[in-house]
Interface confidence: medium
């Protein structure tokens, strides 16, 4: 069957996000992928969106992330814009209202996004074949 347009948008956003490091992509987030054996796909998407929302809510105006230079400022604002878009699209794909995120494990935002990109690409290859 056809791949969801939302899925294509997510992969596109993730490609943009993982291309460019910012001052805060090394900050840690909850690693929901560490022990996701008994988790449905929809729950994974929902929990990923929750983690991203927590991140940008905490760090949108974090001056450590905004940096000192004009370039750092705009890179961070672009990161936040992409994370919000990703959050919105993941919620749409998940179709769930809320989901618990209780894991103790942490990973950097950069690694989290790379892992999410791998999962999304796998999903895309399945639905496009």
């Amino acid at each position: 069957h056809k791949c969801d347009i939302t899925l294509q948008e997510i992969i596109k956003t993730l490609n943009s996000l993982t291309e460019q490091k910012t001052l805060c992509t090394e900050l840690t987030v909850t690693d929901i992928f560490a022990a996701s054996k008994n988790t449905t796909e929809k729950e994974t998407f929902c929990r990923a969106a929750t983690v991203l929302r927590q991140f940008y809510s905490h760090h949108e105006k974090d001056t450590r992330c905004l940096g000192a230079t004009a370039q750092q400022f705009h890179r961070h604002k672009q990161l936040i814009r992409f994370l919000k878009r990703l959050d919105r699209n993941l919620w749409g794909l998940a179709g769930l209202n809320s989901c618990p995120v209780k894991e103790a494990n942490q990973s950097t935002l950069e690694n989290f996004l790379e892992r999410l990109k791998t999962i999304m690409r796998e999903k895309y290859s399945k639905c496009s074949s």
Epitope: A70, Q71, H74, Q78
Partner: nanobody
Amino acid sequence: EVQLLESGGGLVQPGGSLRLSCAASGFTFRNYGMAWVRQAPGKGLEWVSWIDASGTETYYADSVKGRFTISRDNSKNTLYLQMNSLRAEDTAVYYCAKSHGRFDYWGQGTLVTVSS
């Protein structure tokens, strides 16, 4: 043609105040975020403050937080920076910049000197 014209700079004593203005023309001012950026003598460019198109969301660099206030009047196509409790380290040329994914247009700048 985009034009940004800063004014209001000058010599002020430490602890004093200044209000910078930036008159914008050549683009639809109300549709764009705007910023103040400064360059101290012998230093690189440092962003100072940013405001969204509607004037509801603002950002400040740590170095000016609590002392500077950015605002805008979309009916007058003007951006402002109220600077209070000025310090010697605030001495710089202050530029207003149009913000569209990056600071894509700059004014000529206005010099602020804080000295006793």
